[in-house]
Amino acid sequence: ARNGDHCPLGPGRCCRLHTVRASLEDLGWADWVLSPREVQVTMCIGACPSQFRAANMHAQIKTSLHRLKPDTVPAPCCVPASYNPMVLIQKTDTGVSLQTYDDLLAKDCHCI
Amino acid sequence: ARNGDHCPLGPGRCCRLHTVRASLEDLGWADWVLSPREVQVTMCIGACPSQFRAANMHAQIKTSLHRLKPDTVPAPCCVPASYNPMVLIQKTDTGVSLQTYDDLLAKDCHCI
């Protein structure tokens, strides 16, 4: 169940999609990727307060137990719920090729 | 790709499956679940150092960008890679029923 999307911590503080610009050097890809030279990496960042975008029953349990035992059980974490594919031009032994990666860019986020 | 399972932080410190004993009251379930009275909740807890159990390309990117921009990009997070089902006996309007939940107990863990 996709629970409440209202962030009690204030606008933009809770789990959501962010875009971080990164070069191939930043990503450690310069030795095997040719293009694009820069990637707009979409990733999930932000807090997961009680029931905010809870991905499933497990996330709800985690919230309850974190409240009881904060030193033992961490709060739910903001992670991708799904991904957008991205195509890279990459070096190969014989030249260059195209490869689509379907687990590279976050599409939307939830707490788990 | 399931990357290295060797924890550089010392035994048991990195992302792995933990079991936390919880009562129905702890979970906030006492008003709708009859049995079991206590649940051995398996959950994913621990640090995600560089490339440890990286779930996918996104996790690898996150590690790289966290190293560069630790205040902006969080480290990967330890979350369930899969779940074990659990059957609950629960109250209904007409009496009791059995219900299987397939997203309640973590089965194994990875970093994302």
Epitope: S35, R37, M86, V87, L98, Q99, T100 | -
Partner: antibody
Amino acid sequence: EVQLVQSGAEVKKPGESLKISCKGSGYSFTDYWISWVRQMPGKGLEWMGIIDPSGSYTIYSPSFQGQVTISADKSISTAYLQWSSLKASDTAMYYCARVSYYGGYFDIWGQGTLVTVSS
Amino acid sequence: DIQMTQSPSSLSASVGDRVTITCRASQSISNNLNWYQQKPGKAPKLLIYAASNLQSGVPSRFSGSGSGTDFTLTISSLQPEDFATYYCFQLDHSPFTFGQGTKVEIK
């Protein structure tokens, strides 16, 4: 408006050379790749190859490797498809398409250039 | 190279019908598959990307599903403007390849 405008129809003789063009407008030309697609009369679509206009990296389908050359001039936001020696079997409609590497799809297409090769 | 096999190669249907077109890849391509619609004398138009994502501006009667080797394009209620040829396209890795097309004709 984002669009790709291709050069006009061509009628050529076997053995002649040809260069057709595809001009992008309404977007940053170097932020997307350009692909070329062939459609022979009454037939389906065939992927020919792709170019990254920013680095001029090209990748060809093996079926078209050595048969055509894909190039680009980013200063005028134009991609090209050229033949050094046309054959009658090159008679087809040729489409250029903008490739979004985010999402992996051809989202904007040119109107097509009909190339007829006949003696 | 990855071969893409579409079926049927043609079909006749009436306005309001539910139409299903399938596409099979010769090896797993995850969800790296697009669907295009082409009308006579026109350039192809993107309908679905990443197997199931509806392209902006495309009517919701179009939907895509599948992963791995088997994919489906469904038109829930065929409209007069939907009579066209439909192509699947794999972009898992180069060389990218199209299916041979499915022509949807008026019954």
